[in-house]
Interface confidence: low
């Protein structure tokens, strides 16, 4: 039903705590330069607004659209110029144009130091001094560093947070105790907003429907037990939680995404049995517990996919009534007899589906046409297969570091055009994905790869969005999302790429590498190799590989010499000309 | 795309010191060593000094040892040299590179001394 007061009713169902975290979320993620004190500043101002309007919803402004009671509070930073430029020109606009314009300039790379972890006895010293604000400060190092963090999670990673300081900070051992549950936090909350980046990138850049589909295979891998009417009604309330997160509306968000965790919990049994456990909890754990829920059983007897879709005769009158119900159908159905597949690969499956039916039911006899279409899609099925075989292969043979040197060396051949160190970093994120998903089990292996590889690209297709270097990224990026891996697995040595001349001084060392820890070593090396790919693209297996022993015995000897530098001085040049003539 | 800014140079006398600064950005600055080096008019490429990403190791050419200080703020993504003591032999473009490479990537800075 219609509020009076909108900020009055997200405060009385959020609580104050819940609400003074997103209120805090919403200004880090926007306002990503400003101090943590100006921030706390206005969140108290905010909150004792919506106290106002609890107590009197026909207060002044207490009506107006939560966004626009944020917009006004931005607009009145007298430094707002200053500090963000020409973010300060949206406030000219009208909402929601003006909500548009703030969304434009959120910075997914802003130019900030890395979020460092203090010593465990300074960490623990500050967070007994004052848990909340320790906290709030958390919730905005990570907000302005991830501006599209799913907002009601990251108040789940504090609460995990605040929960491992007060156990960790009264042992013996803080260090010990503090560590490894930081460590998991961190590397989860990383994969959560990853993930939350691509749910937006969906939505932004390819619309709902995309969405949709996404969270239609999503869910039917979950909930195989679930009818597609309980699947769409659950996707249609996601899309909407998403949609707001995305846009900034963290508060409906929340609330809506707490409304949406009771409902499931109101009808597991139609769902699935494994709700049990999740909604027994307080509800940010709720909510996050059906998040990362284990996939239900498989019902049994399921009937074979070609009955409904393939030998029935109303396909193509199914298909022009209805189409997009069809289709969500033939996903849904696909979907739950598949968990060991990628989203990618259903997406893809349902696509090449689609397209079949398009051109078949144009044709005279349209059974006779569509009657292979599943032997057709098959290798949509085998390249993904073949594809992480090959790579676990060749990543359980070299190693993490070798396999990353390999990912550098092919991707530079794909977009040499892209700087050395994002090619690097980017080659180092996708070795790391060997590491996570090549030691499953082979039917979770697929789905790990391509669902880890899609976030990655995604953070690959942001940036390069910003700064374009290479209209082959372009390409791949925008022209399908659900075929952005396969787009760039098919890129081969870019013909159009003129070599860089060679420049001895980006293959020149000293004997500050021999101090370097392991991983900037690494990254030196890797820099060192992209350089050398871009001046000899089409240098064979066998060449790069005599260059990089030759590269490794020179590193070992001139760091294990006496005089490192003289060694380094004299022989870096006969190691650069003995490159060259390797590389001939 | 990587973008390193160099400034600070100018003419002094000899004895005399400078802070040279070089802006980074378009990578994440804190993964890479850093490094100093120069150019003299009609020579080649020298290496001056490297820090490590963290900064905690630095590295500087015996010519200008215990005068030259690296130094660098992650915080900032910015680089430093101190120069002491200058001599009119360091007269010279500077540049900062990424890694202990011998490359220039920014426009360098350029440092007189002379009397």
């Known amino acids: 039903e219609a509020h009076k007061s909108e900020i009055a009713h997200r405060f009385n169902d959020l609580g104050e705590g819940h609400f003074k975290g997103l209120v805090l979320i919403t200004l880090s993620q926007h306002l990503q330069k400003s101090p943590f004190e100006e921030h706390v500043k206005l969140v108290n101002e905010v909150t004792d607004f919506a106290k106002a309007c609890v107590a009197d919803e026909s207060a002044q402004n207490c009506g107006k659209a939560i966004a626009t009671l944020f917009g006004d509070k931005v607009c009145a930073i007298p430094s707002l110029r200053e500090t963000y430029g020409e973010l300060a020109d949206c406030c000219a606009k009208e909402d929601p144009d003006r909500v548009e314009c703030f969304l434009q300039h959120k910075d997914d790379n802003p130019n900030l130091p890395p979020f460092e972890r203090p010593e465990p006895e300074a960490l623990c010293t500050a967070f007994k001094e004052n848990n909340d604000r320790f906290i709030g400060h958390y919730l905005y190092e990570v907000s302005r560093r991830h501006p599209y963090f799913y907002a009601p999670e990251l108040l789940y990673y504090a609460e995990k947070y605040k929960n491992a300081l007060t156990e960790c900070c009264e042992a013996a051992d803080k260090a010990a105790c503090l560590t490894p549950k930081l460590d998991a936090i961190k590397e989860k909350a990383l994969v959560s907003s990853a993930q939350q980046r691509l749910k937006c990138a969906s939505l932004q850049k390819f619309g709902e429907r995309a969405f949709k589909a996404w969270s239609v295979a999503r869910l039917s891998q979950k909930f195989p037990k679930a009818e597609f009417a309980e699947i769409s009604t659950i996707v249609t309330s996601l899309t909407k939680v998403t949609k707001e997160c995305c846009h900034g509306d963290l508060l409906e968000c929340a609330d809506d995404r707490q409304e949406l965790a009771k409902y499931m919990c109101e009808h597991q049994d139609s769902i699935s049995s494994k709700l049990k456990e999740c909604c027994v909890k307080p509800t940010l754990q709720k909510a996050h517990c059906i998040l990362e829920i284990q996939r239900d059983e498989l019902p049994t007897e399921l009937p074979d996919l070609a009955v409904d879709f393939v030998e029935d005769k109303e396909v193509c009158k199914n298909f022009a009534e209805a189409k997009d119900v069809f289709l969500g159908t033939f996903l849904y159905e696909y979907s739950r007899r598949h968990p060991e597949y990628s989203i990618g690969m259903l997406l893809r499956i349902a696509k090449g589906y689609e397209a079949k039916l398009e051109k078949c039911c144009a044709e005279a006899d349209p059974h006779a046409c569509y009657a292979k279409v599943f032997d057709e899609l098959q290798p949509l099925i085998d390249e993904p297969k073949k594809l992480v075989q090959q790579n676990c292969e060749l990543f359980d043979k070299l190693g993490e570091y070798g396999f990353q040197n390999a990912l550098a060396v092919r991707y530079t051949q794909k977009a040499p055009q892209v700087s050395t160190p994002t090619l690097v970093e980017y080659a180092r994120k996708l070795g790391s994905v060997g590491t996570k998903c090549c030691s499953l089990p082979e039917t979770e292996r697929l789905s790990c790869t391509e669902n880890y590889l899609a976030l990655i690209l995604n953070r690959l297709c942001i940036l390069h969005e910003k700064t374009p270097v290479s209209e082959r990224v372009t390409k791949c990026c925008t022209e399908s999302l659900v075929n952005r891996r396969p787009c760039f697995s098919a890129l081969h040595v870019d013909e159009t790429y003129v070599p860089k001349p060679f420049h001895a001084d980006s293959f020149t060392f000293h004997a500050d590498i021999c101090t370097l820890p392991e991983k900037e070593k690494q990254v030196k090396k890797q820099m060192a190799l992209v350089e050398l790919v871009k001046h000899k693209p089409k240098a064979s297996e066998e060449q790069m590989k005599t260059v990089m022993g030759d590269f490794a015995a020179f590193l070992k000897k001139c760091c294990d010499a006496d005089n490192k530098e003289a060694c380094f001085t004299e022989d870096g040049p006969k190691l650069v000309a003995k490159c060259q003539a390797t590389l001939a | 795309d990587v973008q390193l800014v160099e400034s600070g140079g100018g003419v002094v006398q000899p004895g005399n010191s400078l802070r040279l600064s070089c802006a980074a950005s378009g990578f994440t600055f804190t993964s890479f060593g850093m490094s100093w080096v120069r150019q003299a008019p009609g020579k080649g490429l020298e290496w001056v000094s490297s820090i490590s990403g963290s900064g905690s190791d630095t590295l500087y050419a015996d010519s200008v040892k215990g005068r030259f200080t690296i130094s660098r703020d992650n915080a900032k993504t910015t680089l430093y040299l101190q120069m002491n003591s200058l001599r009119p032999e360091d007269t010279a473009l500077y540049y900062c590179?990424?890694?202990?490479?011998?490359?220039?990537s920014g426009q360098g800075t350029l440092v007189t001394v002379s009397s």
């Open positions: 590179t990424i890694g202990g490479s011998l490359s220039r």
